[in-house]
Interface confidence: medium
Amino acid sequence: YSQLTSLDVGFNTISKLEPELCQKLPMLKVLNLQHNELSQLSDKTFAFCTNLTELHLMSNSIQKIKNNPFVKQKNLITLDLSHNGLSSTKLGTQVQLE
């Protein structure tokens, strides 16, 4: 599936997002993870997802964003983190979304 550009795994019970996902799917542009059970994001989570334009993370349990998980997403246009448990609008320790 290395040519896959869109992956919709919404409305599941995913609690882990292995960083290798985008190593295997380097062309991925749209990743929909809405309504899953992700609780933490960190630097490695999307480290290889460099071509993403849309990332949908609404309705998870993300309460902690460690360091700079979106620093590699230079092409990101849409990031949806609504309906999570975030207590701050800070999406990491440095400005990442241009």
Partner: antibody
């Protein structure tokens, strides 16, 4: 900061069992995998297996399938490994480890627990 | 199981010298490779993951390269604190397997 706390040294007699613990602070183990690795005296690292604390699913290296049993308690954020039917060549340092959201990269390690098997 | 053959088994390097350690996999591991440093009595520390990604906080003198079955770790300018054991780890297939290890000493 993520920390994995392992406790001290275990002394076991041949044929008995020991249970090692690995308490994680600073990260919810439900969101990752816990790995176990051993190191015999003066030797290299050996991958024992991993557990998914969210559902209890385990994967073992073949040689540890009847030797090690991995469990986890998400309420206390602690993982366990029981070693059964101890033999002298089970004498080793046993490490627990984890990584961000799983995957093969173990980027946080416990300090190791020593197991000595002797009659 | 995938076998990871590491070479050399030991080496001695002078201060400032460039050092390379190789890891050869018995089959293609698609860059699912990490490098660890271990000092006596301590737990391993991650240096490199995904064959060439430097872990946060690791000095830039460490670098990784390779693909397919052949991978290497390079230390550009040996420092006293670089003494220790180095291991590669493949994460392409279960069971994950470590390399045989390389002991690096300061000459």
């Amino acid at each position: 900061e993520v920390q994995l706390q392992q406790y001290g040294a275990e002394l076991g007699k041949p044929g008995t069992s020991v249970k090692l613990s690995c308490k994680v602070s600073g990260y919810n183990i439900w969101s990752t995998y816990i790995y176990w690795v051993n190191q015999r005296p003066g030797k290299g690292l050996e991958w024992i297996g991993r557990i998914d604390p969210a559902n209890g699913n385990t994967i073992y290296a073949e040689k540890f399938k009847t030797k090690a049993t991995l469990t986890a308690d998400t309420s206390s954020n602690t993982a366990y490994m029981q070693l059964s039917q101890l033999k002298s060549d089970d004498t080793a340092i046993y490490f627990c480890a984890m990584g961000d959201h799983g995957g093969y990269v173990m980027d946080a390690w416990g300090q190791g627990a020593s197991v000595t098997v002797s009659s | 199981d995938i076998q990871m053959t590491q070479s050399p088994g030991s080496l001695s390097a002078s201060l400032g010298e460039t050092v390379s350690i190789e890891c050869l996999a018995s089959e293609d591991i698609y860059s699912y490779l990490a490098w660890y440093q271990q000092k006596p009595g301590k737990s391993p520390q991650l240096l490199i993951y995904a064959a060439n990604r430097l872990e946060d906080g690791v000095p830039s003198r460490f670098s990784g390269s390779g693909s397919g079955t052949q991978y290497s770790l390079k230390i550009s300018g040996m420092q006293p604190e670089d003494e220790g054991d180095y291991f590669c780890l493949q994460g392409s297939e279960f069971p994950y397997t470590f390399g045989t290890g390389t002991k690096l000493e300061l000459k």
